[in-house]
């Protein structure tokens, strides 16, 4: 098959996923496109353990994740259920703030300097994290 069995060069393996951490910024949609061309997606945080891992690698820098509400409800880019899933918003966030003067509200989620999440204008050029899952089939016994 085409499943990955090891992480690409310059990616970091953690808990059967591969992560790539940018060192420069792009708008959320452009970061999303970059990850997709890498056969990956913007990082989807599903646990406190994964949150701490990502936070450790990005440091105190605003960084996009794969969570947005551009079409209404909050959605993870890989289809992970938002309502029942892990969340780590800053107090009083998300607030869809309109006071920034850039037009519209705030529809894209990012890690803030303390790792907690905030919603912000999707056009801001923040760093980003791509994630791709390693072949889960290789971890399971073959079907008989």
């Amino acid at each position: 098959g085409s499943e990955r069995t090891c992480c690409p060069v310059n990616w970091v393996e953690h808990e059967r996923s591969c992560y790539w951490f940018s060192r420069s910024g792009k708008a959320w949609a452009d970061a999303d496109n970059y990850c997709r061309l890498e056969d990956a997606h913007l990082v989807v945080v599903t646990s406190w353990e994964e949150q701490k891992f990502v936070q450790h690698h990005i440091g105190p820098v605003n960084t996009w994740m794969g969570l947005h509400d551009q079409n209404g409800p909050w959605k993870w880019v890989d289809g992970t259920d938002y309502e029942t899933g892990f969340k780590n918003w800053r107090p009083e966030q998300p607030d869809d703030w309109y006071g920034h003067g850039l037009g519209g509200g705030e529809d894209c989620a990012h890690f803030t300097d303390d790792g907690r999440w905030n919603d912000d204008v999707c056009q801001r050029p923040y760093r980003w994290v791509c994630e791709t899952e390693l072949d889960k089939a290789s971890q399971e016994p073959p079907l008989l």
Partner: antibody, heavy 121, light 107 residues
């Protein structure tokens, strides 16, 4: 040696179809996104389309959206460009190029020799 | 879409000359910029990526700089094989876009 070899160009009437191929050798084809870039006679470079290594993600220039389709067969190390509803302005040399991801940049580091597509009645 | 412009569109120079080509983007693209060289009848060749990093195998007479909207490609001492057309390309955003090119010919 890392190499890309295009084929399938030729003369076609307006409204006609053509399929370009690009065969890769010397590298792990499925690990790289691939792109098509074209150059009209005497003009500059125009990006046309890109496809991820698995083939699961594709993007197109607005000028070709709905008419040109990029695809790949990783078992054959081959990239394709299906060209339908061709127009005179599609006349160009078509290059396939390997896309590399470096420091968040998308660069084209390996190019084929190009194949000429002429749309004329 | 992000528009790329280049200046000059063409220039004449002699072997040994220092040549500078400018590329500008219609919006800030940070350092998501590449430079390519193309000779007549040949495919383009990647020279520079990430605005200032020299691609492997490219001679050290080529250098580049810039960030945001303004970028330059410099050939410190023009060699006979450097007479060609040079293109910049942005990869901040899809669609990827190229500049119109700068033709460097012999004076």
């Amino acid at each position: 040696e890392v190499q890309l070899l295009e084929s399938g160009g030729g003369l076609v009437q307006p409204g006609g179809s053509l399929r370009l191929s690009c065969t890769a050798s010397g590298f792990t084809f499925s690990s790289y996104a691939m792109s098509w870039v074209r150059q009209a006679p005497g003009k500059g470079l125009e990006w046309v389309s890109v496809i991820s290594g698995s083939g699961g993600t594709t993007f197109y220039a607005d000028s070709v959206k709905g008419r040109l389709t990029i695809s790949r067969d990783n078992s054959k190390n081959t990239l394709y460009l299906q060209m339908n509803s061709l127009r005179a302005e599609d006349t160009a040399v078509y290059y396939c190029a390997r896309r590399i991801a470096v420091a968040g940049n998308d660069a084209f580091d390996i190019w084929g020799q190009g194949t000429m597509v002429t749309v004329s009645s | 879409d992000i528009q790329m412009t280049q200046s000059p569109s063409s220039l004449s120079a002699s072997v040994g000359d220092r040549v500078t080509i400018t590329c500008r983007s219609s919006q800030s693209i940070s350092t998501y910029l590449m430079w390519y060289q193309q000779k007549p009848g040949k495919a383009p060749k990647l020279l520079i990526y990430a605005a200032s990093s020299l691609q492997i195998g490219v001679p050290s007479e080529f250098s580049a700089s810039g960030s945001g909207t303004d970028f330059t490609l410099t050939i410190s001492s023009l060699q006979p094989e450097d007479f060609a057309t040079y293109y910049c390309q942005q990869s901040y955003s899809i669609p990827f876009t190229f500049g119109p090119g700068t033709k460097v010919d012999i004076k």
